[in-house]
């Protein structure tokens, strides 16, 4: 049996930060899990990671190059990245595995967020023309 | 909830080598880090060496590259640190730590748990 998991198909991040949600089709409460966010088309990098269990708070990880929080609902995590630059702009996907109580249980692939990433473009400062002369 | 139990340490000359185990028991992800560090007397527990899970991710502090070598038996759960060309500055007591993030974390504060740490002394 396995959890199915719901993403935006894409993001775009205009101010270098976006939220990404990540929704199950389980309930998180009262259980121990693994959250984590992977980044490229083959999942190689994972770049954020949060763990839950019952008597702990919640525990958010950020690969060193990623500035990552997360928050947990009750069947979703949503992962808020900031300070993002243009060339980490990519699919990313979510993953998620329950530990306990038994039995196991992890997600199907989903089909991933596209994040795209705007580059910050500088307003051209207004021309002043200087005094006229004559 | 993770345990750790570390062995492996003991006194050695200048020059000589040990080789550092840490077995870890309790509930497993698909993916986790496991990493050393050390603390000499007053001073800050430092970072040595980490290695994740899948093997494709590895880390080693400055001081230590080229002699010390981090690897691991997912079999046994087993982190090993071998560690060749050993200084009178590499005495510590070794600490073995596991974080859930994935990568070969260099953050002290990203482990969760700790092992009980075991003594390496190099002296003539």
């Known amino acids: 049996n396995k959890i199915l998991v719901k993403q935006s198909p894409m993001l775009v991040a205009y101010d270098n930060a976006v939220n990404l949600s990540c929704k199950y089709s389980y309930n998180l409460f009262s259980r121990e899990f693994r959250a984590s966010l992977h980044k490229g088309l083959d999942s190689a990098v994972e770049v954020c990671v949060v763990y839950g269990n019952y008597s702990q708070q919640l525990q958010v990880y950020s690969k060193t190059g990623f500035n990552c929080d997360g928050k947990l609902g009750n069947e979703s995590v949503t992962f808020y990245l900031q300070n993002l630059y243009v060339n980490q702009t990519d699919i990313y996907f979510c993953k998620i595995e329950v530990m306990y109580p038994p039995p196991y249980l992890d997600n199907e692939k989903s089909n991933g967020t596209i994040i795209h990433v705007k580059g910050k473009h500088l307003c051209p400062s207004p021309l002043f023309p200087g005094p006229s002369k004559p | 909830e993770v345990q750790l139990v570390e062995s492996g340490g003991g006194e050695v000359q200048p020059g000589g080598s040990l080789r550092l185990s840490c077995a870890a028991s309790?509930?497993?992800?698909?993916?986790?880090?496991m990493g050393w560090f050390r603390q000499a007397p007053g001073k800050e527990r430092e970072f040595v060496a980490a290695i994740n899970y899948r093997r494709d991710d590895a880390d080693y502090a400055e001081s230590v590259k080229g002699r010390f070598t981090i690897s691991r038996d997912n079999a046994k759960n087993t982190v090993y640190l071998q560690m060749n060309s050993l200084r009178a500055e590499d005495t510590a007591i070794y600490y073995c730590g596991f974080t859930y993030a994935g990568w070969a974390s260099s953050r002290r504060d990203d482990y969760n748990y700790w092992g009980q740490g075991t003594l390496v002394t190099v002296k003539p």
């Open positions: 309790g509930r497993m992800f698909s993916n986790y880090a």
